[in-house]
């Protein structure tokens, strides 16, 4: 699914020249070096359909297209998750998944796209004008979430104009903290290679196990601060609240999963095409600021409410991924 | 209406490099993924990369990573895309295509893309 | 990287005929897949879109099915101005990838 990044592996220093401290710091250089190259931004999308057969009844599908790895997606409604939006499901790639009323079915479509069945009756239930949004927590570029409505005339097999406007925003999380990080790291690099300027080179060799990593151009973290600081992403106002879940919010950090069944589908149960695609394991939590940037929606000629920025009340979260990328 | 203006055909000979333009009208620049596309004569379609204008996040095929580069000026909403060290193996249609952003993933807009001969 | 292959390069078909063109990811993709529709000398319009959602103003002669690695775009009642080459593309994952092309020619 990713492209490879072939990483020099280092020719360790003649013993007595730098010690053990002389090489981290030699190594060091090339998982920030990697790092720095490799990080991207995330396209993230939302397709939200009524069924056919059941007119009351939608299907959300959500995608990540980015260079790093899914540790968490969430998927709410009303609005953004953590701007008043209510969480409908979230999909861990390791500890399954949990999914709260009206959600009747929500599952890994392959590794970087999930769908979610919403059930059509009862109070709880979406109307056509709901804001869906699909939040991707991913490493090393953070939390990026995508929101969408019901198209016009959403009968399968035929797509309307859109009038919605859309949603998408990323978190500071993966903008300033992520990529101050990367940043800091690369300036850092620079810092030791003019430093080892002078010092021998070490001898370079292919590695015979060189980690997969993904390819994607860095960009500059100024610019995303600069899009922050200007750009608003346009929210939508929905007549149809759901019913209050609030107590369904997964905040309590990651032991909600404890009273998930271990078989309760982190792999796509059903065509056999997805079980050949097992999601990668993951690593240990780095934490991250929650702050919020924004970019903007398009918003359709005439129609439409203001646009709003939102800031995320919850502070700092918690965001699973692995510290090496995939 | 929506409207992705491309010029036509560029002649520039091996070794030198080109900006190629694509200017967008009839919608919000800034909040569209705009993608590019090489076809070769005779030949299917490769992805070369995207760039979103409202950040100029970008990413790219590994295969012309070292090739292209992508800009956007939004005064003028513009996606530019810079081909550099050129040889006759370059010569090929480069269009410019937009990402629909509310209802999936797929490209709604295409530019009526630009022939890029390579020749001496 | 995904590789998506359209095995048949070319396909001839008559007008009010019905014709598949396939197309195969090299990996599950789930409904991650587009069809797209270039006719000579014209840049490529869109098709099928989620693998069998047909995008607006397109013929309901044109529709789109499949999951996981087999696509398969299906054309009834052929008409003439349907002689063009057809691209199937995942969005699964970058690199964005298109298949090959098949080539509809008209008897």
């Known amino acids: 699914m990713r492209t490879e990044a072939q990483v020099p592996a280092l020719q360790p220093p003649e013993p007595g020249l730098e010690g053990a401290m002389g090489h981290r710091t030699l190594v060091l250089p090339w998982v920030l070096l990697t790092l720095c190259v490799t990080a991207g931004t995330p396209e993230v999308w939302v397709q939200v359909r009524m069924e056919a057969t059941e007119l009351s009844s939608f299907t959300i599908r959500c995608g990540f297209l980015g260079s790093g790895s899914i540790s968490l997606v969430t998927v709410s409604w009303g609005g953004p998750n953590g701007a008043g939006g209510t969480t409908l499901a979230v999909l861990h790639p390791e500890r399954g998944i949990r999914q709260w009323a009206p959600a009747r079915q929500a599952r890994w479509e392959t590794q970087s796209s999930i769908s979610l069945i919403l059930e059509g009756s009862g109070a709880s239930s979406p109307c056509a004008n709901t804001t869906f949004c699909c939040k991707f927590a991913s490493f090393p570029e953070g939390s990026w979430e995508a929101c969408g409505s019901l198209p016009p005339s959403s009968d399968p097999g035929l797509s309307a104009p859109p009038t919605p406007a859309p949603i998408l925003r990323a978190d500071l999380a993966g903008i300033l903290g992520v990529s101050g990080v990367l940043l800091f790291g690369c300036v850092y690099l620079l810092h030791l290679l003019r430093r080892h300027k002078h010092r021998p080179a070490p001898r370079l060799q292919p590695s015979r196990t060189s980690p997969q990593a993904p390819r994607a151009r860095a960009w500059a973290p100024s610019q995303a601060s600069q899009a922050a600081l200007h750009v608003p992403y346009a929210t939508i106002n929905t007549s149809c609240r759901p019913a209050t879940l609030d107590t369904a919010h997964p905040h309590g950090g990651p032991s909600w999963w404890a009273s998930l069944p271990t078989h309760a589908a982190h792999r796509p149960q059903g065509p056999a095409a997805w079980a050949s695609t097992p999601i990668p394991a993951r690593g240990s939590f780095v934490s991250v600021e929650n702050g919020l940037y924004a970019q903007a929606g398009e918003r359709p000629p005439h129609t439409g409410p203001g646009l709003t920025l939102f800031p995320d009340p919850r502070g700092p979260r918690a965001m699973e991924g692995p510290l090496g990328v995939r | 209406q929506v409207q992705l203006q491309q010029p036509g055909t560029e002649l520039v000979k091996p070794g030198a490099s080109v900006k190629l333009s694509c200017k967008a009208s009839g919608f919000t620049f800034t909040t569209h993924w705009m993608h590019w596309v090489r076809q070769r004569p005779g030949q299917g379609l490769e992805w070369i990369g995207n760039?979103?204008?409202?950040?100029?996040?970008?990413n790219y095929n590994e295969k012309f990573k070292t090739k292209a580069t992508l800009t956007v000026d939004r005064s003028s909403s513009t996606a530019y895309m810079h081909l550099s060290s050129l040889t006759s193996e370059d010569s090929a249609v480069y269009y410019c295509?937009?990402?629909?952003?509310?209802?999936?993933?797929?490209?709604?807009?295409w530019g009526q893309g630009t022939t890029l001969t390579v020749s001496s | 990287d995904i590789v998506m292959t359209q095995s048949q390069k070319f396909m001839s078909t008559s007008v009010g005929d019905r014709v598949s063109v396939t197309c195969k990811a090299s990996?599950?993709?789930?409904?991650?897949v587009a069809w797209y529709q270039q006719k000579p000398g014209q840049s490529p319009k869109l098709l099928i879109y989620s693998a069998s959602y047909r995008y607006s103003g397109v013929p309901d002669r044109f529709t789109g099915s499949g999951s996981g690695t087999d696509f398969t775009l299906t054309i009834s009642n052929v008409q003439s101005e349907d002689l063009a080459d057809y691209f199937c593309?995942?969005?699964?994952?970058?690199?964005?990838?298109f298949g090959g092309g098949t080539k509809l020619e008209i008897k």
């Open positions: 593309q995942q969005y699964n994952s970058y690199p964005l990838t």
């Open positions: 295509a937009r990402r629909v952003n509310w209802d999936g993933y797929y490209f709604d807009y």
């Open positions: 760039i979103y204008p409202s950040n100029g996040g970008s």
């Open positions: 990996q599950n993709v789930g409904t991650n």
